[in-house]
Interface confidence: low
């Protein structure tokens, strides 16, 4: 190899050992018979020399310097050449520097042609290598910028005072320009503006100077975004740290088109704005910081560009204004779909302020909009709190819980809502009246309705939850004996279309000892399935639960247990059902924890199921599940 | 009911490949994502990445880039997963397990196939 | 990627003791954690699933809670056969983790 340097060119060469390697044969440079592990070339030398061993590239690199000096006299500006040529170097890993020095009143811009720059952080790479190191100057500190790739958005870079640029080739990449352009502009006044252009959906992650480590004190660095006129950007911080002030506060500052407020100033921790339509610049200004524990400032931030759904242009209105104890939540659900870019999903209150997820709270009027390429990729949850503190006043009140209209004027699709029914203790019951009949589901007739009730105790000591329920059946009502919370969970889109169905009016009862009452009227055309509940967990301990099931005067019933026994074994306590005709008053009872469960029995009137628990041991529930037939009478036994 | 049924163990040696099926029954191979975990010997579980069985792509997490090929024949209801220029640290128990859309825990899970690299 | 750091890894305990595992998460996941139990030489099976819900079929005596980076498996009483390996899986984002497992053995 050869490689000779005009004298006039500023530019030196060094060969040196790179990352040591557990290669056991060792390599050398070899000049003029001489054996050495460094050299280096200066301006007006010319040196011819080889290596000892087949793959230098493993135990070599080669730096090449160019110092540019524009204090003294013009800079040679524009595109940026890499001398020597990369012809006629080793193949080696190389890094070409330029260290450009400039006064503080001259502005330098760096100029990447396409495919523009992408910022990476610690602990990353790029994926050909090819990585450009940027610095800057600060009176004699030096002020990392940042590293960069190929394919990014990154346009130009300005600083002033001086740029210091490392471009980074592994030995096999066979480019032979650096890619970059040098330009003089007016000083910036402040340490950088970095430029960054979108040409379509993306996303950019972009670090404050110095990152991983702390932004110069009481310094002011810009990143101005350039954004098709038909998207949308939105800011997210993915990590920062704030330093510890003396004066002033650290800030990021936004100029936002259209917006009567410029700069928006935020601090670090609030929600960045999102759903930005066209150009923007983003500032990070730091502070004069406590001498004796500065703590450090920085800031890793994403920038989310994308095309506005149709509903990201409407304003959609949720009126909580007239409802008390009541949040809207709309969050992301857990999506299986997944490719290269994730467009952001994101719900803007005001159209400003976006997040992945949001929650309104009753009493106002709340303004939302979407910046989202897919709406399914959202849903709703609702809760509202209905609660009677003064028995007098509540008892035999009736409210409607049904899902209120404007939720279904939303893009998104409601997952639950949830009522908690809240009564004061041992003073009121709740019944709950459907709309339509209500079916329990069970694995052997399971709901196949858009959407179902999921009713539970709404006390945290209890475990207990009574079953899922849809429209369909016989359940005509259900009492329970306190406070309950009632889920309407949907299943599919097609609920607004099933809304209709849904409604369920609660009163407030007296009350009753019992933990749940069933009222059941049965269906000519087919069986119906109840099961205790917290099926698969087993009735709580000393639970008591009935079923009052209506046999019409034409009609006889017959009551099937799905098991011969229970297999509940009682600690302390008896578990024991009975069965009780309505007109005669006659019962019988059954030893849950010791007889077998009766045969399939007919009964002609309307009757009472009920089961009581004792204390299970573990592992030894009370679960019961039963069905109801209805045939018609053959003979009149009235 | 459902099942996920996975082909035998196989002994390869460094540099070869394999190729490791999973066949699905008991119900709609498309409804469901599926996913490869792989557990080397005495270690933990490690997620390797899935296969959207609607449309065929795979997602693969990073130390499962480059070797490592998810692929689907829906006609016959079967997965697959193929890794290529074996090494000995590939020897481990490969599982496929069902996914769920909108839902992503693993409630079906193949008995697993062990694949041992060595010279 | 979203690290999952299960305590202990080795928990000793007599059939009939209570049993709890922790899982905790390098960062917020609400609720998208699952746990498994595998026994030897065979394949995980799903116990619990976001954090707290049930899984049908799986005995009673398991529960889980937790949500944000902290979360819990319970039995509230250990049978002999629970004697196993338990993972928790994070489902919040790709790539899905797991935890290292915590051994449950017998005392």
């Known amino acids: 190899f050869e490689i000779a340097l005009p004298r006039e060119s500023n530019i030196t060469v060094l060969i040196k050992l790179g990352t040591p390697t557990l290669l056991a044969k060792p390599c050398y440079i070899v000049i003029s018979k001489r054996h050495t592990t460094m050299l280096s070339i200066k301006p007006g030398e010319r040196i011819l020399f080889t290596f000892s061993c087949q793959s230098p590239e493993n135990h070599f690199v080669i730096e090449i310097q160019k110092n540019i000096d524009c204090m003294s006299g013009p800079c040679p500006f524009g595109e940026v050449q890499l001398q020597p040529s990369t012809s006629l170097l080793p193949t080696l890993n190389r890094t070409f520097i330029w260290d450009v020095k400039a006064h503080k009143s001259i502005g330098l811009e760096l100029q990447f042609s396409i495919p523009r720059l992408r910022q990476f952080g610690p602990g990353e790479s790029c994926p050909d290598g090819v990585t450009y190191s940027i610095s800057g100057r600060i009176d004699a500190t030096v002020v990392r910028i940042g590293t960069f790739c190929s394919n990014g958005t990154v346009s130009r870079i300005k600083m002033q005072e001086g740029v210091k640029m490392a471009l980074h080739l592994p030995w096999f990449h066979p480019r032979n320009v650096s890619g970059f352009s040098i330009a003089n502009r007016s000083s910036i006044k402040r340490l950088c503006i970095i430029e960054s252009v979108f040409e379509g959906e993306g996303s950019a992650t972009l670090m404050s100077a110095n990152y991983p480590e702390g932004f110069p004190e009481d310094e002011l660095m810009t990143w101005q975004f350039v954004i098709p006129a038909h998207l949308r950007a939105s800011v997210s911080f993915l990590n920062f740290n704030l330093s510890n002030c003396e004066r002033k506060e650290e800030r990021v500052e936004y100029y936002i088109p259209g917006s009567t407020t410029n700069p928006e100033v935020f601090k670090l921790e609030d929600k960045q704005p999102g759903n930005m339509a066209g150009n923007f610049n983003l500032s990070l200004q730091g502070c004069d910081q406590d001498a004796q524990n500065p703590g450090i400032l920085r800031l890793q931030f994403q920038v989310l560009v994308q095309h506005p759904q149709n509903e990201s242009n409407k304003i959609y209105v949720v009126d909580l204004s007239n409802e008390r104890a009541t949040s809207l939540t709309i969050e992301p659900r857990p999506v299986k779909q997944s490719r290269k870019f994730v467009p952001g999903c994101f719900v803007c209150l005001e159209s400003r302020t976006c997040s992945t997820n949001l929650t309104l709270t009753s009493g106002s009027k709340h303004k939302i909009s979407f910046l989202c390429d897919n709406l399914t990729r959202l849903w709703m949850n609702v809760e509202k709190n209905i609660s009677c503190t003064d028995h007098r006043y509540c008892q035999r009140k009736s409210y409607s819980l049904q899902v209120p209209s404007d939720i279904f004027h939303l893009p998104v699709e409601l997952h639950d809502f949830s009522w908690k029914l809240l009564v004061p203790k041992d003073r009121l019951s709740l019944v709950l009246v459907p709309a339509q009949k209500l079916q329990q589901h069970t694995h052997e007739k399971p709901c196949n309705t858009s959407f179902s009730y999921l009713v539970a105790s709404a006390i945290p000591s209890q475990d207990l939850y009574f079953g899922s329920f849809c429209p369909g059946g016989s359940i005509e009502q259900i009492q329970v004996k306190q406070n309950i919370s009632v889920t309407l969970r949907t299943f599919a889109p097609s609920f607004r279309q099933e809304a209709s169905r849904q409604g369920l009016t609660v009163s407030f009862i007296p009350y009753f000892k019992e933990e749940g009452v069933f009222t059941v009227t049965p269906d000519t055309k087919s069986k119906v399935y109840l099961r205790t509940p917290n099926w698969d967990r087993g009735l709580p301990s000393l639970t008591s639960v009935s079923w009052n099931i209506s046999v019409p005067r034409d009609q006889v019933a017959c009551l099937t247990f799905f098991k011969e026994r229970t297999g509940v074994v009682c600690q302390t306590g008896r578990a024991f059902m009975i069965i009780q005709e309505q007109r005669t008053r006659a019962e019988e009872i059954f030893s849950l924890d010791e007889d077998a469960l009766p045969k399939p029995r007919f009964h002609h009137h309307s009757f009472w199921v009920n089961i009581s628990n004792c204390s299970p041991a573990s592992g030894k529930q009370l679960d019961l599940l039963f069905w109801v037939t209805l045939t018609p009478r053959t003979v009149d036994l009235t | 009911q459902v099942q996920l049924v996975q082909s035998g163990s196989e002994l390869k040696k460094p540099g070869a490949s394999v190729k490791v099926s999973c066949k699905a029954s008991g119900y709609t191979l498309t409804d469901f994502s599926m996913h490869w975990v792989r557990q080397a010997p005495g270690q933990g579980l490690e997620w390797m990445g899935w296969?959207?069985?609607?449309?065929?792509?795979?997602t693969y997490a990073d130390d499962f880039k480059g070797r490592f090929v998810l692929s689907l024949d829906t006609s016959v209801s079967t997965a697959y997963l193929q890794i290529s220029s074996l090494k000995a640290e590939d020897t481990a128990v490969y599982y496929c397990s069902r996914g769920r859309d909108y839902d992503p825990h693993f409630d079906y899970w193949g008995q697993g196939t062990l694949v041992t690299v060595s010279s | 990627e979203i690290v999952l750091t299960q305590s202990p890894a080795t928990l000793s305990l007599s059939p009939g003791e209570r049993a709890t595992l922790s899982c905790r998460a390098s960062?917020?996941?609400?609720?998208?954690l699952h746990w498994y139990q595998q026994k030897s030489g065979q394949s995980p099976r799903l116990l619990i699933k976001y954090a707290s819900q049930s899984i049908s079929g799986i005995p009673a005596r398991f529960s889980g809670s937790g949500s944000g980076s902290d979360f819990t498996l319970t039995i509230s009483s250990v049978e002999p056969e629970d004697f196993a390996v338990y993972y928790c899986?994070?489902?919040?984002?790709?790539?899905?983790?797991f935890g290292q497992g915590t051994k449950l053995e017998i005392k």
């Open positions: 960062q917020s996941i609400s609720d998208f």
């Open positions: 899986q994070s489902a919040h984002s790709f790539p899905y983790t």
């Open positions: 296969i959207n069985t609607e449309t065929g792509a795979p």
